[in-house]
């Protein structure tokens, strides 16, 4: 069964940020700022075409 | 540090798993300067279909 879409799971560390409990709460400024920066960054990286978007962002302690 | 996990969606056939990882790794320097994010330990894998069918791209 082909959906016409390929999905990739990506994981990485951000070593200059500290994890705290506000990254477990999507309503906090810290969570939303980091999510916005990461989303913007991926649009920059994969701007050549074919990139449809990202989902299921999760933050956890490193 | 903070571990970030997410799912990326692409039109089928437009990118392979190697280029997803390579293009991300090549952007790390710019990520540090533009977003002040120091990125390391990048890992990419393809998502098995049953999982990906439930998770839309957004």
């Amino acid at each position: 069964l082909s959906t016409g879409v390929s999905f990739f799971f990506l994981s990485f560390h951000i070593s200059n940020l500290q994890f705290n409990s506000s990254l477990e709460d999507p309503s906090t400024d810290y969570y939303q700022e980091l999510q916005r920066d990461i989303s913007e960054m991926f649009l920059q990286i994969y701007k050549q075409g074919g990139f449809l978007g990202l989902s299921n962002i999760k933050f956890r302690p490193g | 540090s903070v571990v970030v996990q997410l799912t990326l969606a692409f039109r089928e056939g437009t990118i392979n798993v190697h280029d997803v990882e390579t293009q991300f790794n090549q952007y790390k320097t710019e990520a540090a300067s533009r977003y002040n994010l120091t990125i390391s330990d990048v890992s990419v894998s393809d998502v098995p279909f049953p999982f990906s069918a439930q998770s839309g791209a957004g």
Epitope: Q48, G49 | E12, N16, H18, Q26
Partner: antibody, heavy 120, light 107 residues
């Protein structure tokens, strides 16, 4: 028209090095990745690695990371592969091959091949 | 690493025969599968990419199919000029491994 012209055959002694060139013409050299492939006599094809001449980014098959170095000269539109510490098992035809542009996952043009013979 | 296993390693068929070469990947390569034809003493030539897309100038008697880990190249009516060795290649992840080749001869 697109052409990849490789340097001529080489005969080297064990322990020596050799540098094979691949001169590209008919397209913008910096916008296509160049791969290198080994074919030992009577054998199949083995992927060595690639270079992106625009960024000089290289990626090697782990098997060849201590055997080969890939470089590119943008001004000469030429890719190079240097092989080190040659042994008899390095005797092979070596091909350069261009990877198609964006979202093109195949080798659309190949050089004519360079035979490297390692013999004492 | 993804291993590519081609079968058969050699085959002999008559002009006009339908011939199928198969290629099995050790993991899902998501249709990032390429077929090349190599004639004796020549460089390989691109035939099929993305598992089923025929490259320009390749006769329509060639076709590619498959998905996941199983792929095949079919020649619907074998011609004398099809005598060559055929290779499949994984282009999903590095190393971009090739199958061991299938040598095709005319009976």
């Amino acid at each position: 028209q697109v052409q990849l012209v490789q340097s001529g055959a080489e005969v080297k002694k064990p322990g020596a090095s050799v540098k094979v060139s691949c001169k590209a013409s008919g397209y913008t050299f910096t916008t296509y990745t160049m791969h290198w492939i080994k074919q030992a006599p009577g054998q199949g094809l083995e992927w060595i690695g690639y270079i992106n001449p625009g960024s000089d980014y290289t990626h090697y098959n782990q098997k060849f990371k201590d055997k080969a170095t890939l470089t590119a000269d943008k001004s000469a539109s030429t890719a190079y592969m240097e092989l080190y510490s040659l042994r008899s098992e390095d005797t092979a035809v070596y091909y350069c091959a261009r990877q198609g542009n964006y979202a093109a996952y195949y080798f659309d043009y190949w050089g004519q091949g360079t035979l490297v013979t390692v013999s004492s | 690493d993804i291993q590519m296993t081609q079968s058969p390693s050699s085959l002999s068929a008559s002009v006009g025969d339908r011939v199928t070469i198969t290629c099995r990947a050790s993991g899902n390569i998501h249709n990032f599968l390429v077929w090349y034809q190599q004639k004796p003493g020549k460089s390989p030539k691109l035939l099929v990419y993305n598992a089923k897309t025929l490259t320009d100038g390749v006769p329509s008697r060639f076709s590619g199919s498959g998905s996941g880990t199983q792929y095949s190249l079919t020649i619907s009516s074998l011609q004398p000029e099809d005598v060559a060795t055929y290779y499949c290649q994984n282009f999903w992840n590095v190393p971009f491994t090739f199958g061991q080749g299938t040598k095709l001869e005319i009976k």
